[in-house]
Structure formats: C-alpha cells, structure tokens
C-alpha cells in the first residue's frame, strides 16, 4: 500500500485531514498529548480502519476499547474503506488517559477521497484502474514485470504533412490516438472538494522534452484533445469536478532511448491543499505512473518477409525482374524506387534499416534512416514513413560520416542463448575497425549509442574495416534452418573456395574458366587462380580477418562450428590494402523466407554447371532453402556491391514481446 501523509492530532481544536483511498496514513498521537497523560484509546467511524502497533496492549477496558501507552514505540496508522459523501464525514476520536485526570479528547475529521492515475501497467493492452500502489512507480522487465509502455509517435498519419506526428502538438484523428498510450485519472470526492484542493499533472523538467500528454475533452460532436504536458510545459493544473469522475489522457513519446535518456518517463498527479489563501499550496498526495519508451527493434533474416524494396536504375531491368520473381515466390509486396527518386543511388540496403516498435496495444514498423545521405536520402522520409510507418534517424546529417555508417554495416542475429544469457530478439551486429588509427573507419558514435540504448538487442562490434566498402554484409549472412538453433550463420570463405577449385583441378578441370559469359572481363582459369601467389596471400589475409569475426560470433552468439556454413568466396586486396570480392559475393544475398536471391558468381562451368553455384546449393538446399542466382555483375558487382546491398526488406515483428525479456 502506498504511503500517505502524516496527521498530527491535538486536543486544543479538531483536526481536518484528507485520506486517499489505498494509502496508509500515519497518525501522530504523542507529540501534542497532555503532559500528565500516560495512555490513549481510539474510537472511529465505521469507514475508518485504525491499526495500532505496540506489543502488548496496556490493558483491556470494560467498554471493549483498549488503551495503549503514550510512548515513542507506538505506531498508529489508518486507512479508509470508501470515499466520503461529504467533507469530514468520518471521525476519529483519541482519548488521552492519566492517573489523576479525566480523559482528554482530540478529534480528527477525515475526508476519504479516491485519486488514482492508471495506465496499462500490466501490459495487457487495457487500462485497469489501480489505486495508489507502490508498483506503479517502478518499471520492471520480464514476464512478471510491470510498468506501462509508450510509443514514439514517429509515423505520419496525415499524408498532407511532411512531419512526424510527434513533431506537432495536435491530434490528427482516432488513428493518431492509437499510436498513443491511454492514461486515466480517476477521482471520487465530495462535491465541494475541489474548492479547497487542486490537482496538478506534471513531469520532471529533464523528461519534459521526451513526452507529450493530451487531455481528451469530450465535446458534443467529437472527442477533441489538447496538450497539457510537453516540451514547453512541465506541469498543468487540472479542472476536476467533485463527485465520481474519470479523465482520459493520451501520452506519446517524443524521443527514443539514447545516451542521455534511459527511456523512462514518470507522470505524476499531485493533490494540493489550497484552502488557506494566505499560505502556499501544500502537497497532500502524489500518485505516479512510470512509462518506458518502446525501443526500436531490428528483425533478422529468420523473420518472415513482408515487403521488398529495390531501386530501378539505368540498365538493371534484368536484376529487377529477378528480384520481382523472388518477391512473388515469397509472397512479398514489392516497392520499386524509380530512377527520378533515387538519383542514381542503387544501394537500398545502405540507406535504411526497417525495424519496429511495440506496445501492448499497437505495433508499428519504423524505418531507421542512415546518415549516409546520398541519392536515396529522401526515400525513407518521403516514401517509407507514412500512416502507421514510423521514422527515426541519428548521426550527423551533413558530412562527418564514413562508409561504416551505411546500413549494409548493420545486421541482427536471430534469437540466441549464450551460456545462460538469453537474447530472445537476437543481437545487433555492426562492423568497426580493429583499433583506432588516423585513417580507421568506425560507425558514428551517435549511431552506436542509439543502438546500445535500445537495450533489447545488445550490440556486437565486428571487424569490417579491412574491406573496401567495410560492411558486415560482405562476409556474413543468416538463413533460416529447420533444426538446431533455427538458423545457420553463413560466412564467406576463401579457404572453402580454394579447396573447391583444387578439387576441380585434381579432377582435370584446371582450364575451366571463371567469368565465362562476362563481356569485357578477363576470364581466369582455375589453374591460374590457384597458381597466383599474390592472390593467395591476399586471401590468406582475408581469411584471418573473417576468422577473427568467426570466433567473435561464436563467442558472442553462443554458436558451434556446426551452426556455421562456409560459402566459397575469393577476395582481392585493392588500394590501401582494402579487400573486395574477386567474383560476385555470394554471401551478400537476399533472404526471403526459404527463398534466397544469391549473386550469380560466374564460376567455372564444369559438366554444364557452375561449380560455385553447385557447391552453394549442396550446402543450403538440405535446409529446405531454394537458391536463385541473380546476375548483378554489371549493375552491382563492379560498383562494389551485390544483391543484399541493392535491396531491403520489411519483416514480420517477433511474436516475443520485448518487455518480457530481461536485458
């Protein structure tokens, strides 16, 4: 039960006090007791429950009431059973007793009121009225946890607007309200109660820019809302009528958790005594609700795909046809960004990452817009954000970004368990340098801070600065699997490729050509690739870089070797010793459920079939996966990217609720 106020009683004159239902009120009977009195007894109206803690009672009086010694060891507390119909309608009488004097009486007139701030603290999607209880003031994780949840109202329900809903202080319509969390103030008081008392709703100054609260005002024609708390307004006096009354508020978050904001927002209603005009208002009671802002959550390749995004650029019609066919097979919606909108920027994966936010009453996809800001920079905000599709961005919007700030360098693992630590929503993966140096690249600190602050997908830093482009999607991917952990980690593997080519040479296929069918490309014989010592040295270096990540991933994701599949791939070191794929990078694939869109490697044709394609199929088809090899050579590969780099996917949110985990 919540703590109420302290009431001091005195025999000199009656005391008037307010007692809020659900609170425990302390009664000070000692400090004003007559000097020659040594004990006291208590009589109450039926609506008041008094509890006296002292062991043992002094003596039982014949009337049935007990007396207790007046000493500091006595604790008197009272609670009320029901709200008062009129002011002071409940009475407590304290009788002080002494050896030589008749009893002296002190009177306390109590007004019982019900004042409670309620929200969906049980996370059921419904607001249940709660009396003032301690639990509302804390937010706890886990299946038995409690505490309300707020969504950042980061979608754009008004198609005419260019701004997010949370950027204005208006409620568009009932759709906009659904993005907010309901909070209800319940009051039950005597009719004249608010002539002498006032309620004020408030938020800490440090949190006022993170939240906006609308009060629903029931008009004759429609429900209208007005802002009562927000970035410019940390408190608001409420006009509450006497009697029984419910007041609804709609709460929206304005900011995601981040470095200086753990995501918790406390809204408090304070009851003030304003009866003495010549004195300042005094706080009689407070009730609070704590909300946590829902984190932005990424979805791994193992989640079912719902929508595929791709760019239309000069001469990529065949690529588009292949992606369209794959999306149809996977029963996905397809969104094509036309040339006039992408400004010759085909790297859809790099521009954005689509995740979601979730409260018990609502789930919303949210696009995280990278700060890379090239030709596609308007696409997330103009074409992706919209009604029930949110938007967030971080990092410098002008300059100061590196290649590692593109979201080909941002992936997430499927759910994993590492030792006895569970990651039911997986872990975020991004690439970094091995150590900071004058020219090393890393993901911008603002992006790293944002990702860490979401708490539910603890990030893992991988090493990717060894690559020309520097993205993790150049050496790893995840695919769904029917067994073990429900997925496999795919890693690009020069070792596996050399092994395959050596086997082919041993079988007499040393003259088979890589890049057959590619115009204006020097075709390479298997035997020449195997005998090129420089290329071998380069791939030995690449293998070491990938192996470093392999061990890191095994440790941080709790993987065994049998959870990993090596995809044959060669790299070459280019300027400044940065690596890029020697032939189309097969691990850079589009995963749509069981349907995989894999860059066509143009490997050596042996017995009428590309030996690289054959090898990859033999590794992935036993998992029930269907491999489609997409020709991206001229339009993507020679421009330092592949199928995954050129596409993006919105996936189904996890069925697991983020608040049920313990970060």
């Amino acid at each position: 039960m919540a703590q109420g106020t302290l009431i001091r009683v005195t025999p000199e004159q009656p005391t008037h006090a307010v007692c809020v239902l659900g609170t425990l009120t302390q009664l000070d009977v000692c400090s004003s007791a007559p000097e020659d009195c040594t004990s006291f007894s208590v009589n109450t109206s039926p609506g008041v429950v008094v509890d006296i803690a002292h062991s043992p009672p002094a003596k039982k009086k014949s009337t049935g009431s007990s007396t207790w010694p007046l000493d500091p060891g006595v604790e008197v507390t009272l609670t009320m059973k029901a709200a008062s119909g009129s002011t002071g309608d409940q009475k407590v009488q304290i009788s002080y007793h002494g050896p030589k004097t008749p009893p002296v009486k002190a009177l306390l007139y109590l007004t019982g009121v019900e004042i409670s701030l309620s929200a969906d603290i049980t996370r059921t999607g419904k607001v249940k009225p709660t009396r003032a209880v301690e639990d509302k003031r804390t937010w706890t994780w886990g299946p038995c946890g409690q505490g309300a949840i707020l969504l950042v109202n980061c979608d754009r329900d008004n198609p005419e607007s260019s701004a997010m809903d949370c950027e204005d202080d208006e409620v568009l319509d009932s759709k906009d309200l659904k993005d907010m969390s309901l909070m209800t103030l319940s009051t039950k008081t005597p009719q004249d109660f608010f002539t002498r008392h006032t309620l004020v709703l408030h938020v800490a100054r440090s949190e006022m820019d993170k939240v906006r609260v609308f009060q629903a005002t029931r008009g004759r024609l429609s429900s209208r809302c007005r802002v009562v708390l927000g970035p410019k307004q940390p408190s608001h006096y409420l006009m509450v009528p006497g009697g029984k009354h419910n007041m609804d508020f709609y709460v929206e978050a304005l900011a995601f958790p981040d470095t200086n904001f753990p995501g918790l927002i406390t809204l408090t209603v304070s009851m003030l005594d304003t009866s003495k005009l010549e004195l300042p208002e005094a706080v009689v009671f407070q009730d609070s609700v704590v909300f946590r802002v829902a984190p932005w959550i990424m979805t791994p390749n193992t989640q079912p795909p719902q929508e595929v995004y791709v760019c239309s650029i000069f001469e990529n019609e065949d690529f588009l046809k292949s992606v369209t066919a794959l999306a149809m097979q996977a029963r996905c919606k397809l969104t094509i960004c036309p040339e006039e909108e992408n400004m010759d920027d085909q790297w859809m994966q790099d521009e954005m990452e689509i995740g979601y936010i979730q409260a018990p009453h609502k789930t919303l996809p949210v696009v995280f817009d990278s700060p890379r800001n090239r030709g596609l920079k308007e696409f997330p905000i103009k074409r992706v954000m919209g009604p029930d599709f949110g938007y967030v961005t971080r990092g410098p919007q002008t300059g100061g970004v590196s290649g590692l700030d593109s979201f080909g360098n941002l992936e997430v693992s499927p759910p994993v368990t590492v030792g006895d630590k569970e990651y039911p929503l997986g872990r975020i993966l991004f690439g970094d340098s091995c150590y900071p140096s004058s020219d090393s690249r890393e993901m911008h600190q603002a992006l790293q801070d944002f990702l860490s602050a979401q708490q539910v997908q603890a990030p893992v830093k991988l090493y990717s600065d060894w690559l020309t482009v520097g993205h993790v999607d150049e050496f790893l991917s995840f695919v769904p699997a029917p067994d073990r952990k429900g997925f496999r980690l795919l890693l690009a593997s020069p070792r596996s490729c050399y092994k395959l080519f050596q086997e082919q040479q041993n079988e007499g296929h040393g003259d088979a050509l890589l890049f057959q069918g590619i115009k204006k490309k020097n075709q390479q014989k298997i035997k020449n690739i195997l005998s090129n010592t420089t290329l071998r040295e380069h791939n030995s270096f690449v293998e070491r870089c990938i192996d470093w990540n392999r061990e890191l991933l095994k440790r941080e994701l709790g993987l065994a070797e049998s959870d990993i599949i090596d995809i044959p791939q060669l790299f070459k070191l280019k300027e400044f010793s940065k690596a890029e794929a020697f032939f189309p990078n097969m691990v850079n694939m589009l995963v749509l459920g069981k349907h995989l869109g894999i860059p066509k490697p143009f490997g050596p044709i042996i017995n009428g079939r590309c030996c690289l394609e054959e090898k990859v199929c033999s590794l992935l088809e036993p998992l029930g996966l269907h491999c489609t090899f997409i020709n991206d050579f001229y339009t993507y590969h020679i421009r330092h990217g592949e199928v995954h780099c050129g596409t993006n996917v919105r996936r189904k949110p996890f069925s697991f609720k983020w608040w049920n985990m313990v970060p």
Epitope: G403, N522, Q524, N532, K572, E575, S577, K578, H640
Partner: antibody, heavy 128, light 111 residues
C-alpha cells in the same frame, strides 16, 4: 579519357574556410580514384587527400587531417575538398588528379597511389 | 623536408643518359612496388611518366625507364632531349600515417 577542372580557390584569411571542386568531363568520375595534391609557390608537390571510387574511404596527409574533408558526389561527377581552419602554410596551387579503378585487375595495381590525369590547378592564398 | 630524398638538380647533354635517385625507407620505397614518377614543366600541371616502379603509361617514350633496389628507386632518361628539361618528382605509397609521399623534386637541366 577523363578531364578534370578545379575551381573554388581564392584569397582567404587565416582561420577561414574554402571549398574546392573538381569537376570531371569525358568520363564517369565514379570509376576513378581521386586525389588532391598541392604545390606551394616555388616548392615541391605535397599529397593532400584521397577518396576511393566506391566513396567508402578517405585518407589525409598528417598536415591537413582534421581540418580538410574530401567528398564526392558521383551524380554531379564532382569531388570536393572542404578546407577549414586555413593557415598561411596552406597557400598553394591545389591540383585534383585521378586514376581509373579497373575492376578487371586480379591483384592490387596501385592505381590509388599514382596520379594518371591532372587538372590545371586552382590557387589558394591564405593571408591576412 | 620531404619524406623521400631526391637530388636537387641533375644535368646532361642532349643524347646522354641521366639517372635521378629517390631514397625512402623500408616503410615506403623498400616495402611497396608503388613508386611513380612525374614530370612538371614550369607553370604546368605534373604529368605521370612511370608507375608501379617501371611501368610506362601509353604515350610516354621508352627513353624513360624506372627501377628499384632496396629503399631507392631510380628514374633513367636516355637520349636526353631539350624538352626533357623539367622538374621530376618521385612518389611512393607508405605505411606511415600519410599514405602517399613525394620527393622534394629534381631539376633536370639539358645543357
């Protein structure tokens, strides 16, 4: 063959800023590595900065790191050198140069380290 | 003070050969085969004449040749001609924090 033209030079006070542009014609600049090299009056060549064709990494000379930023806009076929906190010793003719990033090379050809095509240069004078 | 050391000047008569040296360290010339040479006439932009130690871009006469031994690279111009009079700069990739270094330049005078 690509042709390069630098612009944006001029007189600037110490502590000031300038943005140099290197516009390409005759070919798509996105296929080229681009470097900036400068030459103080009567002095030798000094390598300043580099950006790769994929626009994914940059390098700088110790003398300019933290003050200069190289960037490219492939749609505009232009590379930029943003120069902040300029000093008297930055006075020089600034040349833009490029080398083709040939995807056909089987191993590193070193094209990022030599300058195949040069512009005519633009003079930057830093003086109070 | 340039990172790569070149003689300030060399001279030769028409038809003769001259060699310009470029001395670096084990971290640049000695480590990489990414040495290039540039010719610069007064008031003009430099022109690439040798790359990757000894390779010549198309259009550069075969009188120009490059070589390397240890930490020193050399440019040899045989059959000197009057139009060869210019400043010559060597350059190398380096593993230092400035990844491309130039020499201080050598003034070639054709007597």
């Amino acid at each position: 063959q690509v042709q390069l033209v630098e612009s944006g030079g001029g007189l600037v006070k110490p502590g000031g800023s300038l943005r140099l542009s290197c516009a390409a014609s005759g070919s798509t600049l996105s296929d080229y590595f681009v470097s900036w090299i400068r030459q103080a009056p009567g002095k030798g060549l000094e390598w300043v900065s580099f950006i790769n064709s994929a626009n994914t990494f940059t390098y700088y000379a110790d003398s300019v790191r933290g003050r200069f930023t190289i960037s490219r806009d492939n749609a505009k076929n232009t590379v930029y050198l943003q120069m902040n906190s300029l000093r008297a010793e930055d006075t020089a003719v600034y040349y833009c140069s490029s080398a083709n990033d040939d995807v056909d090379d089987i191993v590193a050809p070193g094209r990022g380290y030599y300058m195949d095509v040069w512009g005519r240069g633009t003079l930057v004078t830093v003086s109070s | 003070q340039s990172a790569l050391t070149q003689p300030r000047s060399v001279s030769g008569s028409p038809g003769q050969s001259v060699t310009i040296s470029c001395t670096g360290t084990r971290g640049d010339v000695g480590r990489y085969n990414h040495v290039s040479w540039y010719q610069q006439h007064p008031g003009k932009a430099p022109k690439l004449i040798i790359y990757n130690v000894y390779e010549r871009p198309s259009g550069v006469p075969d009188r120009f040749s490059g070589s390397k031994s240890g930490n020193t690279a050399s440019l040899t111009i045989s059959g000197l001609q009057a139009e060869d009079e210019a400043d010559y700069y060597c350059s190398s990739h380096s593993r230092s924090s400035t990844p491309v270094l130039f020499g201080g330049g050598t003034k070639l005078t054709v007597l």
